[in-house]
């Protein structure tokens, strides 16, 4: 759903969630293309791109916290991944550099993509949240009680340095939305009943 | 009543620095991402940079990068733009803005009436 | 960057008649559903004033002679019926991506 506007069908909407995040565990939407991009596409470069821990909430944290819980926090986690995503993105290649190297410019259109679909990740956990009458949340288009802090990665003016942690904060992303899936598909057909 | 209010501008020489302030009342400030924009005299507008609500992520435009640190006091209520290595194209009137809307994808609703800063020797 | 094509630069339009302002980005401004774009006025000496955010959404306290449609990579400001004090600029900008952008504005005048 776009712009706020919320589906009341339980299942439509758990429906939408759990496609929205199998799409964003998938590897080669966001984290394949960057490593391409960044020429970090080598063996002995890819092994320092490990998930920094503590990034992101483990999925045993995650199923502890219950339904309105668990929205809250992917609610807000979400709001830091917006940012971390519109920070890799001020320091990618420009289209026009990508071409000169001879560099896919798809890559890029994929990297571009990735904030507009968490935000329309967002805005239906949102909207779960109003189903499941969690009136906790701030509403997607409205300012927050503020995005909390993440770990922020320590400034470094080593581009290569930069890279590395751009490629780790993916690759945690991905292992998170991962997580976020597993969780979904223990949800029950109604708003009033959980498998666990 | 929500409030914005610049101050800092002034004639500096090319080269020099300046530090803009804007002082934020009438809503939580800590809430919402802030902005600069600017207006070089009978021009457009151009956004020069933005910072987060806890202001752990900043945004700027590339040919300010290195040269313009945008920053925040939330306790304060203030935002901040520390312009060195000025040139004479960053003449303009600078205006603080409220971000509002979708993270990251914001627009601006509340302005402040700018300072206006002149770069010349 | 997007690059934001506003046009016309001048607009002469009768009291009471319709007004339309254009604005082509280089590359879409919408995506997942969004568009990313927004519509400001500014009259002289005074800061600009949100009319139009997300490309049709009417910002609280803007009459409804004010609208916005288009989606993409091409929009347009819709004035209704032109009353004397919309005679200024009006400019678009993007927040699809950093950095924002804004258009070069359209002078709004009467005819």
């Known amino acids: 759903a776009a712009m706020g506007s919320c589906s009341k069908e339980y299942r439509m909407l758990l429906g939408q969630l759990q496609k929205q995040t199998d799409l964003m565990q998938d590897t080669s939407r966001l984290l394949d293309p960057y490593i391409r991009i960044q020429g970090l596409d080598i063996p002995k470069l890819r092994e320092h791109c490990r998930e920094s821990p503590g990034a992101f909430p483990s999925e045993e944290t995650l199923r502890g916290l219950g339904r309105r819980g668990f929205l809250q926090t992917l609610n807000a986690t979400l709001g830091r991944v917006l940012h971390r995503l519109a920070d890799l993105e001020q320091h990618l290649p420009k289209a026009q550099d990508l071409e000169r190297s001879g560099l896919n410019i798809e890559d890029l259109e994929k990297l571009q993509m990735a904030r507009p679909n968490v935000l329309g990740l967002r805005n239906n956990v949102y909207c779960m949240a109003q189903l499941l009458d969690n009136s906790d949340m701030t509403e997607p288009t409205k300012a927050g009680r503020g995005t909390p802090q993440p770990p922020t990665p320590t400034p470094t003016s080593d581009v290569f340095q930069r890279k590395l942690e751009g490629c780790s904060f993916l690759r945690g992303y991905h292992r998170f939305m991962h997580s976020v899936g597993r969780v979904f598909s223990k949800w029950g057909e109604s708003p009033n009943r959980s498998r666990r | 009543e929500v409030q914005l209010v610049e101050s800092g501008g002034g004639l500096v020489q090319p080269g020099g620095s300046l530090r803009l302030s804007c002082a934020a009342s009438g809503f939580t400030f800590s809430n919402y991402a802030m902005s600069w924009v600017r207006q070089a005299p009978g021009k457009g507008l151009e956004w020069v940079a933005t910072?987060?609500?806890?202001?752990?992520?900043?945004y700027y435009l590339d040919n300010v990068r290195g040269r313009f640190t945008i920053s925040r006091d939330n306790a304060k209520n203030s935002l901040y733009l520390q312009m060195n290595s000025l040139r004479a194209e960053d003449t303009a009137v600078y205006y603080c803005?409220?971000?509002?809307?979708?993270?990251?994808?914001?627009?601006?609703?509340?302005w402040g009436r700018g300072t206006l800063v002149t770069v010349s020797s | 960057d997007i690059v934001m094509t506003q046009s016309p630069d001048s607009l002469a339009v009768s009291l009471g008649e319709r007004a339309t302002i254009n604005c082509r980005a280089s590359?879409?401004?919408?995506?997942?559903?969004?568009?990313?774009m927004h519509w400001y006025q500014q009259k002289p000496g005074q800061p600009p004033k949100v009319l139009i955010y997300y490309a049709s959404n009417l910002e609280s306290g803007v009459p409804d002679r004010f609208s916005g449609s288009g989606s993409g990579t091409d929009f347009t400001l819709t004035i209704s019926s032109l009353q004397a004090e919309d005679v200024v600029v009006y400019y678009c900008l993007h927040s699809r991506e950093f950095p924002f952008t804004f258009g070069g504005g359209t002078n709004v005048e009467i005819k």
């Open positions: 910072i987060s609500d806890g202001g752990s992520f900043t």
């Open positions: 803005a409220r971000d509002v809307g979708h993270t990251t994808f914001w627009y601006f609703d509340v």
């Open positions: 590359k879409s401004v919408s995506a997942a559903g969004y568009n990313f």
